[in-house]
């Protein structure tokens, strides 16, 4: 059985002021069982944008449904994006740890770029 | 507060059909998953079926190609259709809500199902 | 029969310490949890993906892991433990979800 993968297809995307992202990322495996967060930056300091255990995220929607038992998309949508959301995204895979989680497989990133509305 | 009322159990001869239902209420009941659980009399539990919030399904292998599990998330109601029902089938029903990896978290009181002639 | 395996019954003192074990699953696919089953009663989720405790259940009972078996260990039994407690799972090979079946405990 080959190792998971977390696939992120989208080097860049470009998305206006006000307009929703879409950031694509998808898993070769169902296992090791685990849940997908979703941060914007790399390192210590990285930010969590979505959590597929817990929390609430007001402006992210999945683009499929998670519930599904054999769901491999993990994709997103951000919606009413700013020049705040500007950066770059990583989908990444936690395999189940005791007492936390641990950081097991991460996408190449999907750099988000907005395009300011016209004045 | 979450909430989950099994109805629709009762007394079927074998072969027959029943509908059970679940009313769900104090959650938002369109994004969680649900199972079916039952037990029989003096027995362990035995999951019967899953559903998805879109509506993928899942069964155990006891019930597959007699059971179908479906739902109304505008009614916030879960459905167990039972047919082809045999003695075996006898079982105290119970539907649960499902965590984000398909455990369980709620659970409702339960309705007894008797297949008898 | 149970794809899980647990011992059939633990009998403990009350203020003792009860550790009921479960095994049969893949440590790679599978998530555990505990569930209480007092008689004529619905079960009740005491610990869910191996090791988490709900909010409304009290901090005696915990659950830990340790390669492909799983422990529920209740600190300082009380008579109101007494119940049947199951280990359930997810397993995400087969998309099923199995149980094992069952521990009956007695609070001496």
């Known amino acids: 059985e080959e190792e998971l993968q977390v696939i992120q297809p989208d080097k860049s995307v470009l998305v206006a002021a006000g307009e929703t992202a879409t950031l694509r990322c998808t898993a070769t495996s169902l296992i090791p069982v685990g849940p997908i967060q979703w941060f914007r930056g790399a390192g210590p300091g990285r930010e969590l944008i979505y959590n597929q255990k817990e929390g609430h995220f007001p402006r992210v929607t999945t683009v499929s449904d998670l519930t599904k038992r054999n769901n491999m998309d993990f994709s997103i949508r951000i919606g009413n994006i700013t020049p705040a959301d500007a950066g770059t995204y990583y989908c990444v895979k936690f395999r189940k740890g005791s007492p936390d989680d641990v950081e097991f497989k991460s996408g190449a990133g999907t750099e988000l770029s907005v395009r300011a509305k016209p004045s | 507060e979450v909430q989950l009322v099994e109805s629709g159990g009762g007394v079927v001869q074998p072969g027959g059909s029943l509908r059970l239902s679940c009313a769900a209420s104090?959650?938002?009941?369109?994004?969680?998953?649900m199972s079916w659980v039952r037990q029989a009399p003096g027995k362990g539990l035995e999951w019967v079926a899953g559903i998805s919030s879109g509506s993928d399904t899942y069964y155990g292998d006891s019930v597959k190609g007699r059971f179908t599990i479906s739902r109304d998330n505008s009614k916030n109601t879960l459905y167990l259709q039972m047919n082809s029902l045999t003695a075996e089938d006898t079982a105290v029903y119970y539907c649960?809500?499902?965590?984000?990896?398909?455990?369980?978290?709620?659970w409702g009181q339960g309705t007894l199902v008797t297949v008898s002639s | 029969s149970y794809e899980l395996t647990q011992p059939p019954s633990v009998s403990v003192s009350p203020g003792q310490t009860a550790r009921i074990t479960c095994s049969g699953g893949?440590?790679?696919?599978?998530?555990y949890a505990w569930y209480q089953q007092k008689p004529g009663q619905a079960p009740v989720t005491l610990i869910y993906?191996?090791?988490k405790r709900p909010s409304n259940i009290p901090e005696r009972f915990s659950g830990s892991s340790s390669g492909t078996t799983v422990t529920l260990t209740i600190s300082g039994v009380q008579a109101e433990d007494e119940a049947d407690y199951y280990c359930g799972g997810y397993d995400q090979s087969s998309y099923t979800n199995p149980f094992g079946g069952g521990t009956k405990l007695t609070v001496l």
């Open positions: 649960a809500r499902e965590t984000w990896n398909h455990l369980f978290d709620y």
């Open positions: 893949s440590y790679s696919s599978y998530y």
């Open positions: 993906s191996d090791d």
């Open positions: 104090g959650f938002t009941f369109s994004s969680n998953a």
